[in-house]
Interface confidence: medium
């Protein structure tokens, strides 16, 4: 760029002057240097302004995107809280259902015990009945009657 | 910085000139000012370019990080949706299990009633059997046979 | 801005010089240009420095905000993981409760079958008992004894 070329030509300005007056060529060199510097500065200003504008534009876009992302994150956080509440309710409900199952199991065990007791009672009745049937007379005529008949005859 | 020092020394350029020609010292002051300005501008350009490059680099990193964070947020949102679906399925399943438990309880109550009826039946049978046992003859010989024996003798 | 005005006035510097010496007016124009350029550069430097500082400040704020948002996102991700684990545990627990209910149902069905078998056994006992009661003698005196009495008399 015009700016980057060193203006070291200025140093050659009448190193050993014989006169107290400035030469036109020297002034022209100066003027040219000034012109170049002005143009360089103008370009740099223009370019820098553009870049800074771009940066600010990008920063604004970032700002907006950031805001959107923050909103989204807050939304997710909120939904996550809601989900956490739902999950907690589910845990409570699950615990209730588990307790219900345990209670059912308890009732079932109780019923099973009652059934066992009932079964034992039925077995006991059956044995008593079997004994009773076995002790019943086999024939309609009693042996005492038969012997008596013989005796009388 | 060289730029920040005011170039007010230019104002002392032959305020009351006796000649129409420029003095070499004046031009040298000018040339020196121009040189200083050039160097100052060069430094500033270099420094500003570096800073703007840094900024753009940082913006690029931000852009990438932002993109990554956005992806991560989208991913979280997606996983959260999935989690919501899973939680919903769990709620449905929980409800099913609860209904299953209620149905089981209903079956159990019904079975309990049947068991009570059966137990009452067993108790009734037991009483009948007890009566039957109590009405059985105590001795093997009937009293009628004994009296008949006596009568015959 | 002062910079944006073109310094083309320098080109009018004695295009056809009759003398080899510089005119004071020309040097003054140069000096004025140099002064303007210096002021312009000073303004621009000041303004650019301010803007770049603003940008860096904004970038730092972004950096911090970004860090916070990243932390928040990581936190959400962590909580989401935790929630996923909880949901998984819930699924397992739900499955356990479901299996418990199925097992309970199986026990219940088995108990129902046992109860039916027991009921049939009771019915059989009841019939046996009924037969036994029906086969009991109606009167305390046996028919053989009566006929024998008649015979003896």
């Amino acid at each position: 760029s015009r700016i980057d070329q060193d203006n070291s030509s200025f140093d050659s300005l009448s190193p050993e002057p014989k006169s107290r007056f400035a030469m036109l060529d020297d002034v022209k060199i100066l003027a040219n240097g000034l012109l170049q510097l002005g143009h360089g500065l103008k370009d740099f200003v223009h370019k820098t302004k553009g870049q800074i504008n771009d940066i600010f534009q990008k920063l604004n876009i970032f700002d907006q995107s950031f805001y959107d992302l923050s909103l989204q994150t807050s939304e997710i956080k909120e939904e996550e809280k809601e989900l956490r509440r739902t999950t907690y309710k589910l845990q409570v409900k699950n615990e209730e259902v588990k307790n219900m199952s345990l209670e059912l199991n308890s009732k079932l065990e109780s019923l099973l015990e009652e059934k066992i007791l009932l079964q034992q009672k039925v077995k006991y009745l059956e044995e008593q009945l079997t004994n009773l049937i076995q002790n019943q007379p086999e024939t309609p005529e009693h042996p005492e009657v038969t012997s008596l008949k013989t005796f009388v005859e | 910085s060289r730029i920040d020092q005011d170039n007010s020394s230019f104002d002392s350029l032959s305020p009351e000139p006796k000649s129409r020609f420029a003095m070499l010292d004046d031009v040298k002051i000018l040339a020196n000012g121009l040189l200083q300005l050039g160097h100052g501008l060069k430094d500033f350009v270099h420094k500003t370019k570096g800073q703007i490059n840094d900024i753009f680099q940082k913006l690029n990193i931000f852009d990438q990080s932002f993109y990554d964070l956005s992806l991560q947020t989208s991913e979280i949102k997606e996983e959260e949706k999935e989690l919501r679906r899973t939680t919903y399925k769990l709620q449905v399943k929980n409800e099913e299990v609860k209904n299953m438990s209620l149905e089981l309880n209903s079956k159990l109550e019904s079975l309990l009633e049947e068991k009570i009826l059966l137990q009452q039946k067993v108790k009734y049978l037991e009483e009948q059997l007890t009566n039957l046992i109590q009405n059985q003859p105590e001795t093997p010989e009937h009293p009628e046979v004994t009296s008949l024996k006596t009568f015959v003798e | 801005s002062r910079i944006d005005q073109d310094n083309s006035s320098f080109d009018s510097l004695s295009p056809e010089p009759k003398s080899r010496f510089a005119m004071l007016d020309d040097v003054k124009i140069l000096a004025n240009g140099l002064l303007q350029l210096g002021h312009g550069l000073k303004d621009f430097v000041h303004k650019t420095k301010g803007q770049i500082n603003d940008i860096f400040q904004k970038l730092n704020i972004f950096d911090q905000s970004f860090y916070d948002l990243s932390l928040q996102t990581s936190e959400i991700k962590e909580e989401e993981k935790e929630l996923r684990r909880t949901t998984y545990k819930l699924q397992v627990k739900n499955e356990e409760v479901k299996n418990m209910s199925l097992e309970l149902n199986s026990k219940l069905e088995s108990l129902l079958e046992e109860k039916i078998l027991l009921q049939q056994k009771v019915k059989y006992l009841e019939e046996q008992l009924t037969n036994l009661i029906q086969n009991q003698p109606e009167t305390p005196e046996h028919p053989e004894v009566t006929s024998l009495k008649t015979f003896v008399e």
């Epitope: 308890s106 009732k107 109780s110 009652e114 066992i116 007791l117 006991y124 | 309990l112 068991k115 | -």
Partner: antibody, heavy 114, light 112 residues
Amino acid sequence: QVQLVQSGPEVKKPGASVRVSCKASGYLSDFIITWVRQAPGQGLEWMGWISTYSGDTDSAPKFQGRVTMTTDTSTTTVFLELRSLRSDDTAVYYCARGRLFDYWGQGTLVTVSS
Amino acid sequence: DVVMTQSPLSLPVTLGQPASISCRSSQSLVYSDGNTYLNWFQQRPGQSPRRLIYKVSNRDSGVPDRFSGSGSGTDFTLKISRVEAEDVGVYYCMQGTHWPYTFGQGTKLEIK
């Protein structure tokens, strides 16, 4: 923690009735409560059972017609009533949980004396 | 009714020594569900009975592992591997297979 707490000692005259209570706590839902008695210096004797769930009862043949077992579900308390008391009914009466007696009450001494 | 016979009725034991109580039933105690409902109870002096063993060999929670139950059909045994002072009391076997339920007459364990 399962606990069965019984009522205090009783002194009764022959022919009278006695009512012993047994309050259950610390366990879910319903169980069978069994009654067992122990005469002084003697062994254990099974008397019968009651279901706190259905209210069903059953007693050993020796006590049938003389014993009544009831339950109050609101207070989870079970009662044993023994009528027509004789001197040989003097014993410590225990309530126990379940068909196979996994937890026992502290016992209630019933003395039948004229 | 099923008769439960315990032996010995009195058992003097030295602390740290093993002890064994036998219980015989007049009928097999195997129930139709495959289980054998034979329990062992401990009654310390002045206390309520406490179940030690259920279904022949299952130790109740809180019962020291020096207590063990074994047996099948009509013959059952309660063993104490090393008797301690707190084991003094009367031990009862009880059947829960046949209605009505019956207990053994008890074995008194005392320290020599």
